[in-house]
Interface confidence: medium
C-alpha cells in the first residue's frame, strides 16, 4: 500500500518542519521532580518497541509504523548499556539493581553489589545497595510497585530486596542452609525491608502458609500457599498500618483505590505471575493500566510526592516462549499504562522514565509490505522453498526437531496467539539479548537523559531529579519534598 | 570475569555522578553549523553497535562492554523510524532519500518522492527531491562523498542522484527502453547532476567504456569498464575543473590530499565495492579513516564550510552474508573514521551525525560471560545437544540444508572471519530489519536530535543547522556560510 499523501514531498517536509519546531521549543526544566515514575518494559528491546508500534497502529486501523506509542512522545532518549558485572548479556535481577539502585551487580542477584556471589548467602551482608524507592520513602514520599509478574519477581524486587538468588520467592525456595545463615526470601523482604504504600501484581502463593487454599483457585493445590514458616505475610503487613487494605480481584481494587480511608494497598491478583493480557479475565483481574491508575490515585494524595515503579513484566515471558503475539500485546498494554499515567500526572512535577532491563534475540525482517500484519509472512519463499515469518528469533523453543526439517508456515498459523516464531538454535527458553536498550524521558530533569549511558545512570538521574540521596544538595527549585 | 573495582558500589556511584555532571553541563549551542558531516553505518542497528563496542574494546585488551565507541561519546541520541512508504522494512535507496533529502520514497528508488515507482522510468521526472548536499553546494559550501562501497551505490547516490532503480550503476545496467526515455545511470548522474568536490570509494568499472582494462586488475576482463555509451566519465569529470585530480590507489590519494593545487578529487580504489577491511591491501587501498581524513583536508579549505557524507557501507554486506566478523570489523573501521574526523574538526562549528539507514536481523544473546569473545559460544548446549554461538541471525545464508540437521560448532570455527552464523530461515542473503535505529549527534544544533523521529528528520536538522533551504531564515548566529 502506498498512501497517496505520502507521495507528495510536502507531506514529509511539513511533518519534519513541525518536528523541528517542536525540538526548538524544548526547554529543559530547572525544577526538581516532586514525583518519579519508572516504567520498565521487561525484555523490551528496540525491535520489540518498533514491532509493538506497528501492531498498536494496526489495531487502530492504521498502516502501522507512522503511528506513535505513548513512549514515542517522550522528548528525550538515551541508550542504556545493560551488561552485568559478570555477563555480557544480563538477567532481570542484575539489571534491576542497576536501574533501581544505581550500582551494577552480578547475574541473578538483586539489590547487591558485585561483591556478592550468586547463590552464596554468606556474601549478602555488607553488600546491600539501597534503591531510589527506599530513598524516596525516607524523604517522606509515598512509594509503589506495580507489575504484571509476581511482585516478588526480579524487577520489582530490585526496589526493596537484597538477595543472592532471584529465585528465592518464598522461604520454600531458599535452601535450609541459607535460611540458617539468615538469608530471607523475597516475599518476607517485601513486607519487612521497608514501608511500601502500594503493592500491585501477582504472587499470592508466596505470602501464605503451605496448605492455604488460593481464593481464586481453591481446588488447585499447586496454586495455594507455599510458605514453610507458617507465616501469613499479608496478615503481618495489614497489622503494620491502620489504613492498610488487601485485595485479590479487580472489583476490590477499584473500590479500594477510591476509598479515602485506604492509606496502604496490597493487591495480589494471581498466585504467581498475572495472566497474559490476552488471557486475562477482565471481571477478576485488573489490567496493568488499571493497576497503574489505582496506584496513582493513592500515591498522589501525598503532598511530598511519590515514587512509582510500573512493570510490563510479561513482555519478557512472551519472548522467552518465542511467542511474539504475547510479547507484543503485553507491550501494548504496557504502553497503554504509560499513556494513562500521562493523563493522570503533570510533566511539570513528574519525571517519567520508560526503559527496558534488557532486550531479546527477536528480529523483524524480510521486507514485508507496509500495512501487512506484523505476524505475517515475508514476501517470497526461503531457500528450502517454504514460507517464513517476518518475526523470528535467534534462539528459542520455536524449533521443530522432528526430521530436522524446518516446518512450513501459513499466514493463519503465524497469526495465532499461540504460534511460536522459528529460531536458529533450539532452546527450551529463548534468551535475552545484550544490545543497548532505549530510555525515554519526560518531565523535570528529563533533559539529563542523553547519549549512551550505563544502565546505572537511570537510578542516579531519578535520585538527582528528586534531590534524594546522594544528591540532597541538588540545587534545584522548587526543592524536592515541597508541594507545588 | 568480575573486575575487582566493579565490586565496589563506589565505582558505579562515582561513574554515574560524573556522567550526571557532564549531562548538567550540556549547553545547546545557539549558533549555526558551518560544516555538516553525516556518518552512515549501512545496516548498523543497535545490536551491531553494541557488538562492535565489545569487539573494539576487546581488541584493546579490555573486557568489552564498558568501553566507548567514538559514536558513544556524542552527547545527543534519537531513534529514527526507517520504514519506506511502501515497506515496513526498507532498503538503502529509500532510506538514503529520507536522511539525505528529507522525504520518504519507495523501496529501491533513490532521490525521488514516493510518487515514483520502482523500475518505471516514466515516473522519474517531476518527482525528484533535492539532497542537503546539493543545497549545501548551492550555498557555496564544498561537498564530498566517501564510502567503502562503490560511489554509485544506493546510500551515496542519495546525495546526488534520482533514479527509479538503485541497480542502474552504469548505462549497461539500464534497460534500453529506459535509456530511450531519458533515464540516466547513476555514474552519469554522479558527474553531471551537481559539482561534487570530493568523491572517494569504489566503483571504477562504471566510469569507463566496455573493454577498458582496470589499472589494478588489467587481466581480469570482468573488472574492466562496463559502459556501453563509450564514455570515459572520469575524463569528462576532470575536464570540468582545472584543479581536478583522479586517483586510484592509496599512495596517490595521500599525495593529492596534501597538494594545494587540487580543488576537486575523485578516488576510485576498486572496480566495484572496496574490499572488506580485513581483506584490504593497505599498500594499494586506503582505509575509510584515511579517505575521511583526505576528504576533510580538502573540504576544510573552504571558508564557507562543507558538507561531507561518510559511509561504512559494507557493515551491511557482512550482515547479508551472515558473517558477523566482517560486519563488526567494518563497524570498527567506521567508528575509527568518526574518531579521526572528530580530531580534525571542531564541535564549535561542525554538526556531526552518526546513524544507520536500517538494521539487520542480527542478535547477540545466550548469556556469555563478561570478557568472552563476541564470536564465541554460549555457555551450555542447545536442545539438540550441540553448541551454539552468541551471535545469530533470524534469517540468512548461515544455514546448512544437508540432512536438515543444525551443524555443531566449535569456538575455533565460530571465531573464523569466514564463519557464517546460523539462522532460523535459509536465505541466499540475510535481510534488513525494520526496528528503529540510533542517531548520535554532536555540534551546533545537535540538541534538536531528540526523542523518536521519522528518518526524514535527519536531513531537516542538517539543513536547519546550516541555514540551508528551506531554512535560510533559520535565525541562528553566526549565519551559515560565514567563517568563524
Amino acid at each position: 500500500i502506498i498512501p497517496v499523501e505520502e507521495e507528495n514531498p510536502d507531506f514529509w517536509n511539513r511533518q519534519a518542519a513541525e518536528a523541528l519546531g517542536a525540538a526548538k521549543k524544548l526547554q529543559p526544566a530547572q525544577t526538581a521532580a516532586k514525583n518519579l515514575i519508572i516504567f520498565l518494559g521487561d525484555g523490551m528491546g528496540v525491535s520489540t518497541v518498533t514491532a509493538a508500534r506497528i501492531l498498536k497502529g494496526q489495531k487502530k486501523d492504521k498502516l502501522g509504523p507512522e503511528t506513535f506509542l505513548a513512549m514515542d512522545r517522550f522528548p528525550y532518549v538515551a541508550l542504556s548499556k545493560t551488561y552485568s558485572v559478570d555477563k555480557h548479556v544480563p538477567d532481570s535481577g542484575a539489571t534491576a539493581t542497576a536501574y533501581l539502585c544505581g550500582v551494577k551487580g552480578n547475574f541473578q542477584t538483586i539489590g547487591l553489589s558485585a561483591a556478592a556471589r550468586f547463590n552464596q548467602c554468606n556474601t549478602t551482608r555488607g553488600n546491600e545497595v539501597i534503591s531510589v524507592m527506599n530513598r524516596a520513602k525516607k524523604a517522606g514520599k509515598s512509594v509503589g510497585v506495580v507489575t504484571t509478574t509476581r511482585v516478588q519477581h526480579a524487577s520489582p524486587a530490585g526496589a526493596y530486596a537484597h538477595t543472592v538468588n532471584r529465585n528465592w520467592y518464598s522461604d520454600a525456595d531458599v535452601p535450609a542452609s541459607a535460611r540458617q545463615e539468615g538469608c530471607q526470601d523475597i516475599a518476607t523482604q517485601l513486607i519487612s525491608n521497608m514501608d511500601i504504600d502500594v503493592i500491585l501484581g501477582g504472587g499470592r502463593k508466596y505470602m501464605f502458609p503451605m496448605g492455604t487454599p488460593d481464593p481464586e483457585y481453591p481446588d488447585d493445590y499447586s496454586q495455594g500457599g507455599t510458605r514453610l514458616d507458617g507465616k501469613n505475610l499479608v496478615q503481618e503487613w495489614l497489622a503494620k498500618h491502620q489504613g492498610a487494605r488487601y485485595v485479590w480481584n479487580r472489583t476490590e481494587l477499584l473500590q479500594a483505590s477510591l476509598d479515602p480511608s485506604v492509606t496502604h494497598l496490597m493487591g495480589l491478583f494471581e498466585p504467581g505471575d498475572m495472566k497474559y493480557e490476552i488471557h486475562r479475565d477482565s471481571t477478576l483481574d485488573p489490567s496493568l493500566m488499571e493497576m497503574t491508575e489505582a496506584a496513582l490515585l493513592l500515591l498522589s494524595r501525598n503532598p511530598r510526592g511519590f515514587f512509582l515503579f510500573v512493570e510490563g513484566g510479561r513482555i519478557d515471558h512472551g519472548h522467552h516462549e518465542s511467542r511474539a503475539y504475547r510479547a507484543l500485546t503485553e507491550t501494548i498494554m504496557f504502553d497503554d499504562a504509560i499513556e494513562r499515567a500521562g493523563q493522570l500526572t503533570s510533566e511539570e512535577d513528574t519525571l517519567s522514565l520508560v526503559t527496558a532491563d534488557h532486550s531479546h534475540v527477536f528480529s523483524f525482517g524480510g521486507y514485508p509490505l507496509r500495512g501487512s500484519s506484523i505476524f505475517g509472512l515475508a514476501p517470497g519463499k526461503a531457500r528450502d522453498r517454504k514460507a517464513y515469518t517476518v518475526l523470528l528469533y535467534g534462539n528459542g523453543p520455536g524449533y521443530v526437531l522432528k526430521d530436522g526439517a524446518r516446518p512450513d508456515v501459513t499466514e493463519s498459523e503465524s497469526g495465532s496467539p499461540e504460534y511460536r516464531q522459528q529460531s536458529a538454535v533450539p532452546l527450551d527458553g529463548e534468551t535475552h539479548a545484550g544490545e543497548d536498550v532505549a530510555v525515554f524521558a519526560r518531565g523535570p530533569q528529563a533533559h539529563l537523559v542523553h547519549g549512551v549511558q550505563e544502565q546505572t545512570f537511570i537510578a542516579h538521574v531519578m535520585a538527582f531529579a528528586a534531590c534524594l540521596e546522594p544528591y540532597t544538595a541538588c540545587d534545584l527549585a522548587p526543592r524536592a519534598g515541597t508541594t507545588d | 570475569i568480575i573486575p575487582v573495582e566493579e565490586e565496589n558500589p563506589d565505582f558505579w556511584n562515582r561513574q554515574a555522578a560524573e556522567a550526571l555532571g557532564a549531562a548538567k553541563k550540556l549547553q545547546p549551542a545557539q549558533t549555526a553549523a558551518k560544516n555538516l558531516i553525516i556518518f552512515l553505518g549501512d545496516g548498523m542497528g543497535v545490536s551491531t553497535v553494541t557488538a562492535a563496542r565489545i569487539l573494539k574494546g576487546q581488541k584493546k585488551d579490555k573486557l568489552g562492554p564498558e568501553t566507548f565507541l567514538a559514536m558513544d561519546r556524542f552527547p545527543y541520541v534519537a531513534l529514527s523510524k526507517t520504514y519506506s512508504v511502501d515497506k515496513h522494512v526498507p532498503d538503502s535507496g529509500a532510506t538514503a532519500t529520507a536522511y539525505l533529502c528529507g522525504v520518504k520514497g519507495n523501496f529501491q528508488t533513490i532521490g525521488l518522492s514516493a510518487a515514483a515507482r520502482f523500475n518505471q522510468c516514466n515516473t522519474t521526472r517531476g518527482n525528484e527531491v533535492i539532497s542537503v548536499m546539493n543545497r549545501a553546494k548551492k550555498a557555496g559550501k564544498s561537498v564530498g562523498v566517501v564510502t567503502t562501497t562503490r560511489v554509485q551505490h544506493a546510500s551515496p547516490a542519495g546525495a546526488y542522484a534520482h533514479t527509479v532503480n538503485r541497480n542502474w550503476y552504469s548505462d549497461a545496467d539500464v534497460p534500453a527502453s529506459a535509456r530511450q526515455e531519458g533515464c540516466q545511470d547513476i555514474a552519469t548522474q554522479l558527474i553531471s547532476n551537481m559539482d561534487i568536490d570530493v568523491i572517494l570509494g569504489g566503483g571504477r568499472k562504471y566510469m569507463f567504456p566496455m573493454g577498458t582494462p582496470d589499472p589494478e586488475y588489467p587481466d581480469d576482463y570482468s573488472q574492466g569498464g562496463t559502459r556501453l555509451d563509450g564514455k570515459n566519465l572520469v575524463q569528462e569529470w576532470l575536464a570540468k575543473h582545472q584543479g581536478a585530480r583522479y586517483v586510484w590507489n592509496r599512495t596517490e590519494l595521500l599525495q593529492a590530499s596534501l597538494d594545494p593545487s587540487v580543488t576537486h578529487l575523485m578516488g576510485l580504489f576498486e572496480p566495484g565495492d572496496m574490499k572488506y577491511e580485513i581483506h584490504r591491501d593497505s599498500t594499494l587501498d586506503p582505509s575509510l579513516m584515511e579517505m575521511t581524513e583526505a576528504a576533510l583536508l580538502l573540504l576544510s579549505r573552504n571558508p564557507r564550510g562543507f558538507f561531507l557524507f561518510v559511509e561504512g557501507g559494507r557493515i551491511d554486506h557482512g550482515h547479508h552474508e551472515s558473517r558477523a566478523y566482517r560486519a563488526l570489523t567494518e563497524t570498527i573501521m567506521f567508528d575509527d573514521a568518526i574518531e579521526r574526523a572528530g580530531q580534525l574538526t571542531s564541535e564549535e562549528d561542525t554538526l556531526s551525525l552518526v546513524t544507520a539507514d536500517h538494521s539487520h536481523v542480527f542478535s547477540f544473546g545466550g548469556y556469555p560471560l563478561r570478557g568472552s569473545s563476541i564470536f564465541g559460544l554460549a555457555p551450555g548446549k542447545a536442545r539438540d545437544r550441540k553448541a551454539y554461538t552468541v551471535l545469530l541471525y533470524g534469517n540468512g545464508p548461515g544455514y546448512v540444508l544437508k540432512d536438515g540437521a543444525r551443524p555443531d560448532v566449535t569456538e575455533s570455527e565460530s571465531g573464523s572471519p569466514e564463519y557464517r552464523q546460523q539462522s532460523a530461515v535459509p536465505l541466499d542473503g540475510e535481510t534488513h530489519a525494520g526496528e528503529d535505529v540510533a542517531v548520535f549527534a554532536r555540534g551546533p544544533q545537535a540538541h534538536l536530535v531528540h526523542g523518536v523521529q521519522e528518518q526524514t528528520f535527519i536531513a531537516h536538522v542538517m539543513a536547519f543547522a546550516a541555514c540551508l533551504e528551506p531554512y535560510t531564515a533559520c535565525d541562528l548566529a553566526p549565519r551559515a556560510g560565514t567563517t568563524d
Epitope: P3, V4, E5, K60, D61, K62, T67, F68, S372 | -
Partner: antibody, heavy 123, light 106 residues
Framework: EVQLVESGGGLVQPGRSLRLSCTAS????????MSWVRQAPGKGLEWLAL??????????EYSASVKGRFTISRDNSKSILYLQMNSLKTEDTAVYYC??????????????WGQGTLVTVSS | DTQMTQSPSSLSASVGDRVTITCKAS??????IAWYQQKPGKAPKLLIH???TLQPGVPSRFSGSGSGRDYTFTISSLQPEDIATYYC????????FGQGTKLEIK
C-alpha cells in the same frame, strides 16, 4: 470509477427487521474497509458500523447506539455490503449511506459515499 | 469513545469573507481528522483528510490545520457555491462526526 448503490430502504414498523444492501463496483471490493453511516431528517451524520478488509480478516465494529441490534456483513463474491437491522425503533428513521474507506496514510477516512437509501420506522 | 465538538452550529457570512469552523476532540486524535461538505439531498463530499490534505479537485480556498485535540477548517474567500453544511470526522479511533455547521450567505 468507484460506485456505491444502496438499496433495501422503505417503510417498516417498530420492532421489525430490515436488511440494507450496497452494491459496489469500480474497485477491488475485498481490499477496502466499508462502513454504514446514517442521517436522521434535519440532523447530523452518525457512523454506525465498520467491516474491515481481507487483510484484517473482515472484522467488525459498531457504534454504541446500534451494537447488538445491527449487523454489518459482506458478500465478497458479489461485492455487496449489508446492514441487517433488527428491533427497529422510530429513532432509526434516517437516510442510510454506505461508504468506502480510502487507505491513505490516515488509514480509513470515508472517501466514497453512495447516494443513500431512506428508512422510515413508523407504525 | 472519542467525542467531537464542532462550532459554531451555524454561521452567516458574505461572499469573499474568510470563514472558520473548529472541531475539538475529547482526546488527542493524532491529526486523523477529515472535513466534509454536504448539500441538501446529497451525500457528503470529502474535502480534506489528515488535517490538511486537500482531496484532488477541491479548490485551494479550502484548508485545514491543527494538532492534538484542536482543529480548524477555513474557507479563505467564501463563494456562493460553498453554501452547505460542513462536518468534521475523527477517524483515529473508529469514527465520530462533529454536529455540523450550517453555512449561509448574508
Amino acid at each position: 470509477e468507484v460506485q456505491l448503490v444502496e438499496s433495501g430502504g422503505g417503510l417498516v414498523q417498530p420492532g421489525r427487521s430490515l436488511r440494507l444492501s450496497c452494491t459496489a463496483s469500480g474497485f477491488t471490493f475485498t481490499d477496502y474497509y466499508m462502513s454504514w453511516v446514517r442521517q436522521a431528517p434535519g440532523k447530523g451524520l452518525e457512523w454506525l458500523a465498520l467491516i474491515r478488509n481481507k487483510a484484517t480478516g473482515y472484522t467488525t465494529e459498531y457504534s454504541a447506539s446500534v451494537k447488538g441490534r445491527f449487523t454489518i456483513s459482506r458478500d465478497n463474491s458479489k461485492s455487496i455490503l449489508y446492514l441487517q437491522m433488527n428491533s427497529l425503533k422510530t429513532e432509526d428513521t434516517a437516510v442510510y449511506y454506505c461508504a468506502r474507506a480510502s487507505f491513505y496514510y490516515d488509514g480509513k477516512v470515508l472517501a466514497y459515499w453512495g447516494q443513500g437509501t431512506l428508512v422510515t420506522v413508523s407504525s | 469513545d472519542t467525542q467531537m465538538t464542532q462550532s459554531p452550529s451555524s454561521l452567516s457570512a458574505s461572499v469573499g469573507d474568510r470563514v472558520t469552523i473548529t472541531c475539538k476532540a475529547s482526546q488527542d486524535i493524532n491529526k486523523y481528522i477529515a472535513w466534509y461538505q454536504q448539500k441538501p439531498g446529497k451525500a457528503p463530499k470529502l474535502l480534506i483528510h489528515y488535517t490538511s490534505t486537500l482531496q484532488p479537485g477541491v479548490p485551494s480556498r479550502f484548508s485545514g490545520s491543527g494538532s492534538g485535540r484542536d482543529y480548524t477548517f477555513t474557507i479563505s474567500s467564501l463563494q456562493p457555491e460553498d453554501i452547505a453544511t460542513y462536518y468534521c470526522l475523527q477517524y483515529d479511533n473508529l469514527y465520530t462526526f462533529g454536529q455540523g455547521t450550517k453555512l449561509e450567505i448574508k
